[in-house]
């Protein structure tokens, strides 16, 4: 029996019956057998056929077989009821050989030409399969010449059988307190040849309960128990299961915070596998009552295990634990069913005693010492020495605790100083120099440090001088000894106040004229204001209409007197106004350098002479009074003058205020 | 991490003011709780001097009201303790502290030295 | 003023012995605001016990508070050498917060 071509030899070829073209002999028997290479399968199909026709071709015959299955048996030219001829069908080997056997009976009624046929190995596409049979791969199957090879959607990993899919269903860890899980694919069929674990895995303190929810079908056996798929629950005090079938298993409380959960599956079976929905419970905390003027939130039936609670107060009371105050409480519930924070107090804000308003007063209005949320209080400054600044004085203890004003400020009210009060009052003539009387100018300061010197009281805590006055202490402010409220120098009772800082105008220059002769000492405590004890006002803008030539001024201090000494009371002189082009003129002539009078000064005197102001009244204020607030105000500041004081047609000359408001009000803003 | 550092003179003379400065990282002292001042005597003895709120109120220890004042800098995340006219007996070391009123939210600085000597 | 009285000052304990030591209050405390220091020589006291009964963080379990009103206590089961400290009570249930003298607890 011939052999056909063998693989790795080309696969294609002819066979024909003995003697073809011409008649077949008969008592002939010829077999061939074709060999494809692996994952080929061999084609073959008849050009020319005529064999001897009989019952079920029992005398004359070509039959094709494939391993162990017999393809066709072939005679005759066209098919029959019972007998079948090749016509123009295709034939496939069912694997990578096929066998060929002619036969003939040992007679013919007539001769009979055989048979011609062509064969050929092709791939086969082992991924197509028919209707209903098995698919070849789980899921999806790739034909390449000689072969396939099956692949998994992602999530699955291919078995070692090369066909099957399992799933990758293990290392899920579920640590939410309720959740869902269910066999790959739910409610698809589960996939088999699998192994899947879940683990849930809470917190120490919670019990996993399980509830299969939907349907249950795993495949089961009558007899023996789930011997093919199965699900188990395991915990760290017992196991659950197995479990398999179609009945919904009952609801399983671990008592465990860990569950593992292990389904196994075969290769077989077309199942749709289950669902599992946990939840968790533990050990609930004391309810949370909240307290008086608080509530709770969230509000729930029941706080477990990590559950939360906040409390928050109605406006106007605040958190306490104990003496200290909170901003925000919340409090979790532990695993042994404690809170681990103690419930706080909602208290009544209490913004405290109010404080003390320096030369002012506090009253309380809603109650005598109440100083709780909502009451409210009124600060007023002492009457007449004192006036408040910007704000009406009434604070309302609001929900932060803090006392708080109408303008929403927090900070104190501020009494300021009422300025430019004087107990005389002038007539408008000129006087002599005369002596003070008590509350004439109560701003008048002496300054005591190497020479005798004067300044006026600005505010509670500033006093406004010459800057030659106090040059030779600028670095040893400590050194100038300050009285005020006083009218006699030698006086053992006046009001003592020290030197913090000294501040000279940085155009001053000592020893080189008088120009910006201007300087501000900073007290280092507030002095207590009275009659006796007034600061001057500074100059409105409006000021100039009331110091023009000829207006009357009032000079005071204890500068030399017409005696040549030192006055012992306060004296003080009323002069006019000098035209300043003519004091310029009058300080021109030898031995005063040129320009010696600046636009930063004023002159005030009588051209006949006899008053003025002199040595020892330096840095004292030059007043006047404002007409429409009733307030005197420093206009001048005692700078300079003739050699010998009081000279006719010489004046005194004076530091002129009103120029040098804005580096006043720089320096006690900034100190 | 929350911490707390104190800083200040060391040495003080009598009569004079004393000036501390706790500094924190880590939580904002206007977030929550109560910052409080703490001391320790050379015998051990530990007092509560005063605290400033995480709103800026404060209260202090009555025995220490007149002298005491503690205010802050929420720009800095700092508060203060200033203690008036100081003397021997003021002599400590003293801490910035948390007082927990949370789980585990106590926090103490290390401390610093006060001596008042002349 | 609440006073606190820690009893007693010193006291010394073996490796493995019981230990208590009691903080009474002059009136009554919340146990929600009685707390409980560690110090050791050097440092700053540490968060022991808080709300009298609960252990701070890292605290060993051999430690537990307890007490209610005027009277509280703190146990050590089984004294460790490590455990050798001052210990402090705290209340912050009124004004002025109040510590006691503290217990030395030396190790025998």
């Known amino acids: 029996t011939p052999l056909g071509p063998k693989w790795p030899e080309p696969v294609f070829g002819r066979l024909a019956s003995p003697g073809f073209p011409g008649e077949y002999a008969n008592d002939q028997e010829r077999r061939w057998t074709l060999t494809a290479p692996p994952g080929y399968r061999l084609r073959l199909y008849f050009t020319h056929f005529d064999l001897e026709l009989s019952h079920l071709c029992e005398y004359d015959f070509v039959k094709l077989s494939s391993g162990a299955k017999v393809l066709a048996t072939l005679c005759g030219q066209e098919s029959t009821d019972t007998e079948r001829a090749p016509g123009k069908d295709t034939f496939y080997s069912l694997g990578s050989s096929l066998d060929i056997t002619f036969r003939s009976d040992y007679s013919n009624e007539k001769p009979f030409t055989g048979f011609e046929a062509f064969y050929a190995a092709e791939d086969i596409d082992e991924c197509q399969v028919a209707p209903g049979e098995a698919p070849t791969c789980d899921h999806h199957c790739h034909n390449h010449l000689g072969g396939f090879y099956c692949s998994c959607r992602a999530g699955y990993v291919l078995h070692r059988n090369k066909r099957t899919c399992s799933a990758l269903c293990s290392g899920q860890v579920f640590t939410q307190r309720s959740g869902e899980l269910s066999s790959p694919e739910y409610p698809r069929p589960y996939p088999k040849l699998s192994s899947c674990t879940y683990s849930i895995s809470l917190e120490e303190g919670f019990s996993v309960i399980l509830d299969f929810v939907e349907s249950f079908d795993v495949e089961t056996h009558p007899e023996t128990l789930c011997p093919y798929d199965f699900l188990k629950i395991q915990t760290d005090r017992e196991e659950h299961g197995p479990f398999c079938g179609k009945t919904l298993p009952h609801r399983i409380e671990t008592k465990s915070n860990t569950v593992t959960i292990t389904f196994v599956t075969d290769e077989s079976g077309d199942h749709t596998g289950w669902k599992i929905h946990y939840t968790s419970t533990a050990q609930p905390c004391p309810y949370p009552m909240a307290p008086p003027n608080g509530h709770v939130s969230p509000v729930q039936a029941k706080y477990i295990l990590k559950d939360s609670f906040s409390i928050f107060c109605e406006t106007g009371y605040e958190l306490l634990q104990g003496h200290l105050p909170l901003k925000s409480f919340t409090a979790v519930c532990q695993k042994d069913g404690s809170w681990d924070r103690p419930m706080p107090a909602c208290s009544i804000v209490d913004c405290g005693p109010p404080d003390d308003l320096p030369s002012g007063r506090v009253e309380y209005i809603t109650g005598p010492g109440v100083t709780t949320y909502k009451a409210v209080i009124q600060y007023s400054c002492e009457e007449t020495f004192y006036t408040m600044k910007v704000n009406d004085g009434k604070y309302v203890c609001e929900a932060d605790g803090f006392w708080t004003s109408s303008k929403g400020e927090k900070s104190l009210p501020v009494c300021e100083p009422v300025c430019g009060l004087s107990a005389r009052t002038t007539g408008g003539r000129i006087y002599g120099g005369q002596k003070a009387k008590p509350g004439d100018f109560p701003w008048q300061v002496l300054i005591l440090g190497g020479t005798t010197a004067a300044g006026a009281l600005l505010y509670d805590n500033w006093v406004l001088t010459a800057a030659h006055a106090v040059y030779e202490q600028k670095h040893d402010a400590s050194a100038l000894d300050i009285r005020m409220g006083t009218l006699k120098r030698l006086s053992p009772h006046y009001t003592q106040a020290w030197s913090e800082a000294v501040f000279i105008h940085e155009g001053y220059t000592h020893d080189a004229g008088f120009d910006n002769d201007i300087a501000l000492i900073k007290l280092n405590n507030k002095v207590v204001i009275n009659s006796n004890i007034t600061p001057i006002c500074l100059p409105r803008k409006e000021a100039e209409s009331f110091m023009r030539t000829d207006d009357i001024g009032t000079a005071s201090g204890w500068g030399l007197t017409q005696r040549g000494f030192l006055a012992r009371n306060l004296m003080y002189v009323d002069i006019p106004i000098v035209d300043h082009q003519k004091c310029t003129a009058a300080y021109e002539k030898p031995p005063y350098p040129r320009g010696s009078v600046t636009a930063n000064m004023l002159c005030a005197g009588l051209e006949s002479g006899g008053k003025d102001s002199c040595r020892g009244d330096s840095g004292g204020a030059l007043v006047f009074l404002d007409s429409e607030t009733e307030r005197w105000f420093v206009g001048g500041i005692v700078s300079w003058g003739s050699m010998n004081c009081g000279e006719a047609g010489q004046y005194g000359v004076y530091t002129k205020v009103i120029n040098y408001i804005p580096w006043i009000e720089n320096i006690i803003s900034d100190f | 991490d929350v911490q707390l550092q104190e800083s200040g003179p060391g040495l003080v003379r009598p009569s004079q003011s004393l000036s501390l400065t706790c500094t924190v990282t880590?939580?904002?002292?206007?977030?929550?709780?109560?910052w409080n001042w703490i001391r320790q005597f050379p015998g051990n003895k530990l007092e509560w001097m005063g605290y400033?709120?995480?709103?800026?109120?404060?209260s202090y220890n009555p025995s220490l009201k007149s002298r005491l004042s503690v205010t802050r800098d929420t720009s800095k995340n700092q508060f203060f303790l200033q203690l008036n006219s100081v003397n021997a007996a003021d002599t400590a070391t003293y801490y910035c502290?948390?007082?927990?009123?949370?789980?585990?939210?106590?926090?103490w600085g290390q401390g610093t030295t006060l001596t008042v000597s002349s | 003023q609440i006073v606190l009285t820690q009893s007693p000052a010193i006291m010394s304990a073996s490796l493995g012995e019981r230990v208590t030591m009691t903080c009474t209050a002059s009136s009554s405390v919340s146990s929600s605001y009685l707390l409980w220091y560690q110090q050791k020589p050097g440092s700053s006291p540490k968060l022991w016990i808080y709300?009298?009964?609960k252990l701070a963080s890292g605290v060993p379990v051999r430690f537990s508070g307890s007490g209610s009103g005027t009277s509280y206590s703190l146990t050590i089961s089984s004294m460790e050498a490590e455990d050798a400290a001052t210990y402090y009570c705290?209340?912050?249930?009124?004004?002025?917060?109040?510590f006691g003298a503290g217990t030395k607890l030396e190790l025998k």
């Open positions: 502290a948390i007082i927990s009123t949370a789980v585990d939210f106590d926090y």
């Open positions: 709300s009298s009964s």
């Open positions: 400033i709120s995480y709103s800026g109120r404060t």
């Open positions: 705290l209340q912050y249930n009124r004004s002025p917060l109040t």
């Open positions: 880590g939580y904002s002292i206007t977030s929550d709780y109560a």
